[in-house]
Interface confidence: low
């Protein structure tokens, strides 16, 4: 075209993808009649006629633009709707009269990329690798033109650095003409980078100016050798026998080394490996005083086969030994005195208490209990409790039975029992004394004795109610070396009118019981005995 070299730079029109571009033909009236104009698109230096204006009327040419062009502003402006990246080219209008002149417009198209998507390398990166390793990948989809990417570590931009930082970016063109940018950050990392925050930033331009979008921050797994291993004990604080104690190894490497826990044998002073669970934790449950001692942890790095040892840690499992009471089985006459002494060993200072077993009453705070002017009632159980006040729950106890010499003492002297003929009675009689008494009955039947405690005995008797038995009644006699004593059971026939609704049950046994510590009580139920077999 003659004189093309002198053509002024094309007018710049900037629009976003999807919007409408207004292409205003800048020919003056002297350069051409705007009622007679041809519009061309120029792509790779090839002109294509896309629109004609004749007598102010517009007509699209068949082709890629025919559905998207229209005339505005009394014919001076061509509107291109739904702009795509492929529309970024030169458009020109050419006036036909009085002589052929043209006006060029450069259309620039923009589209903000989507939020950048960052993916960290989940496989991790070893420190001191021979070459930069993949840290993360940043993807910015559907932008136009190609956005610029900047990588940041801990808020500071990263620059290419030979053998240290390498940024590898590539782009693909989608069918829409938009670009998807992929940028891979490769770096040589050090141990301190285990907590480093990486992110990428996309810089792009719109008609309104420059903009940027940031990805989320990510950390990358960093593999680094262990420099230190140490032991941790749970629970913290004072330990006692019976506790569940966990001893675990910890390390400052990633991944952690393979751990083993050893305890020093107090005899040989040799470290002996302990058996840990599948998580490498040594569980002492229940902890015993023998678990006390010096523990250490060994961490073996399987990559380097370097072994590291922790500082040894002393473990103290506090204990209270078995409690010993002297005398162990005291016997005293009524009116005499008795001194009970309690002993125990512990890893800590001990506190002693004496309690009455039957009532729980505290009698003495200290290892020695003195009892004076002993009565029969003073016989029975006394408990010594040895405890460590600084460690709640750490205590041991011992029960001692004090025996007061005396003749048998009956739970009741006499009582009435309601019965029916032919029923089987289950009678009981209880006595105490020291030495422990034995019980005999004045009637034949099946008797059995049970020792209730060192001074107390309970005898039960099963007997058939007969007219003779009703007449004689039943006596139980308790005797020991120091004397004897008797209880009498009076048997009374039940009238039918006094029967309770369930007193004719055929399964129960009549019982009559009493105890020195409870009020005597007696219940009766009957059991029919089988009739003798009749012989024909």
């Amino acid at each position: 075209v003659p004189g093309e070299a002198e053509q002024p730079a094309p007018e710049l029109v900037e629009v976003e993808v999807g919007s409408t571009a207004l292409l205003k033909c800048g020919l003056s009236q002297s350069q051409g009649n705007l009622s007679h104009v041809d519009w061309f698109s120029v792509h790779k230096e090839k002109r294509t006629l896309i629109f004609r204006v004749r007598q102010g009327q517009g007509q699209s040419e068949p082709g890629e633009y025919e559905q998207r062009l229209s005339l505005q502003d009394r014919g001076a402006t061509l509107a291109l709707t739904q702009v795509t990246p492929q529309d970024e080219r030169i458009f020109l209008c050419q006036g036909k009269r009085p002589r052929s002149q043209e006006y060029r417009i450069q259309l620039r198209v923009y589209k903000a990329p989507e939020e950048p998507n960052i993916q960290v390398n989940p496989l991790g990166i070893p420190v001191n690798s021979k070459e930069p390793e993949e840290v993360a990948t940043c993807v910015g989809r559907n932008g136009y033109p190609i956005p610029q990417v900047i990588w940041y570590k801990n808020g500071r931009p990263l620059k290419e650095e030979k053998n240290r930082v390498h940024i590898q970016s590539s782009q693909t063109v989608e069918s829409s003409g938009l670009y998807t940018l992929q940028s891979i950050l490769k770096a040589q990392l050090v141990k301190e980078d285990k907590d480093a925050q990486f992110y990428c930033e996309l810089n792009y331009r719109l008609p309104s100016g420059n903009h940027m979008k940031e990805s989320r921050e990510v950390t990358v797994p960093v593999f680094y050798p262990t420099e230190k291993v140490w032991l941790e004990v749970e629970p913290v604080g004072m330990l006692k026998e019976g506790d569940r104690v966990e001893i675990r190894c910890l390390a400052d490497g990633n991944p952690p080394p393979h751990f083993s826990i050893s305890k020093q044998n107090p005899s040989t002073r040799e470290a002996e490996e302990e058996t840990t669970n599948d998580n490498g934790v040594l569980v002492l449950e229940p902890a015993r005083k023998e678990h006390s001692g010096r523990y250490e942890c060994q961490g073996l790095d399987l990559d380097t086969m370097i072994s590291l040892l922790s500082e040894p840690q002393e473990l103290l499992v506090n204990y209270v030994s078995d409690v010993r009471v002297s005398p162990a089985a005291p016997e005293r006459q009524e009116g005499s005195s008795l001194t009970l002494t309690c002993e125990a060993e512990s890893s800590q200072d001990l506190e002693f208490q004496w309690l009455r077993e039957e009532t729980g009453q505290v009698l003495e705070r200290g290892p020695v209990l003195q009892l004076h002017d002993l009565k029969r009632e003073a016989g029975g159980g006394y408990r010594c409790v040895a405890s460590v006040p600084s460690i709640p729950g750490l205590n041991r106890t011992q029960l001692v039975n004090v025996a007061i010499f005396g003749p048998p003492w009956m739970a009741f002297k006499e009582r009435k029992v309601w019965v029916k003929e032919n029923m089987v009675l289950n009678l009981s009689c209880e006595a105490s004394g020291h030495p422990r008494p034995t019980i005999s009955w004045n009637v034949n039947g099946t008797a059995s004795e049970q020792d209730q405690d060192p001074q107390r005995v309970l005898s039960t008797l099963n007997v058939l109610v007969t007219p003779e038995l009703l007449e004689t009644g039943v006596e139980c006699t308790a005797s020991n070396d120091l004397g004897k004593n008797t209880s009498i059971l009076f048997l009374e026939l039940v009238n039918l009118t006094t029967l309770t609704p369930d007193s004719n049950t055929t399964t129960g046994l009549s019982t009559s019981t009493a105890s020195p510590h409870t009020r005597a009580n007696s219940t009766s139920t009957e059991r029919k005995l089988p009739e003798p077999e009749s012989r024909g």
Epitope: N121, P122, L123, G124, P126, S129, K130, E131, E133, E134, P221, F223, N254, P255, P256, H258, F259, T276, D278, N279, G280, L302, D303
Partner: antibody, heavy 121, light 111 residues
Framework: QIQLVQSGPELKKPGETVKISCKAS????????MNWVKQAPGKGLKWMGW????????TYADDFKGRFALSLETSASTAYLQINNLKNEDMATYFC??????????????WGQGTSVTVSS | DIVLTQSPASLAVSLGQRATISCRAS??????????MYWYQQKPGQPPKLLIY???NLESGVPARFSGSGSGTDFTLNIHPVEEEDAATYYC?????????FGSGTKLEIK
């Protein structure tokens, strides 16, 4: 000795949920990751994802994002695979495999015996 | 994703002879001097068993008749001499990047 023992076979209806367990013994559970691999009847092996037993962080292959969840019960040295909203194409044997990963190594060195999941209406 | 192409799909080898299985990756699985290629053996009804790690290292307890070689994109598993118990399906697998992928498998029969 090192063992991975998986839970027994499962028969489920479409839309139901299944949770497979993989109990590890004989090694320190938190020193190794755990991979999960799918094998459809008569087909090859397909990697589903892995879970970092030290941090509890799961990573999934694209085809197994959404309905699939990897989890741990570290105190019991057990890893779990849960599949929600079961579909017919989930019918397969699922393997857990210990992940020997460190600075220079990423191997699946010990495998569970596999758990067969049948999906049938 | 890295695609692993195994060949042949199946092969029959006489007892005592050599079996060679090939695995080609769609891009390099080597970095920092290491090749992240692994070989597994699977028998019917059993889980896979690791044979070779990092392309050429024999896993502990695996017989020395198994060997692996290769780097970059081309890898080979050799079994020599083949024994009756080697009848199985063999898979290659990479762990260069996520996702890990397996080859489609090679079924070895013993003649």
């Amino acid at each position: 000795q090192i063992q991975l023992v998986q839970s027994g076979p499962e028969l489920k209806k479409p839309g139901e949920t299944v949770k497979i367990s993989c109990k590890a013994s004989g090694y320190t559970f938190t020193n190794y990751g755990m991979n999960w691999v799918k094998q459809a009847p008569g087909k090859g092996l397909k990697w589903m994802g892995w879970i970092n037993t030290y941090t509890g962080e799961p990573t999934y292959a694209d085809d197994f994002k959404g309905r699939f969840a990897l989890s741990l019960e570290t105190s019991a040295s057990t890893a779990y695979l849960q599949i929600n909203n079961l579909k017919n194409e989930d019918m397969a044997t699922y393997f857990c495999a210990r992940y020997r990963y460190n600075k220079y190594e990423r191997a699946m060195d010990y495998w569970g015996q596999g758990t067969s999941v049948t999906v049938s209406s | 994703d890295i695609v692993l192409t195994q060949s042949p799909a199946s092969l029959a080898v006489s007892l005592g002879q050599r079996a060679t299985i090939s695995c080609r990756a769609s891009k390099s699985v080597s970095t920092s001097g290491y090749s992240y290629m692994y070989w597994y053996q699977q028998k019917p009804g059993q889980p896979p068993k690791l044979l070779i790690y990092l392309a050429s290292n024999l896993e502990s307890g695996v017989p020395a008749r198994f060997s692996g070689s290769g780097s970059g994109t081309d890898f080979t598993l050799n079994i020599h001499p083949v024994e009756e118990e080697d009848a199985a399906t063999y898979y290659c697998q990479h762990s260069r990047e996520l996702p890990f992928t397996f080859g489609s498998g090679t079924k070895l029969e013993i003649k």
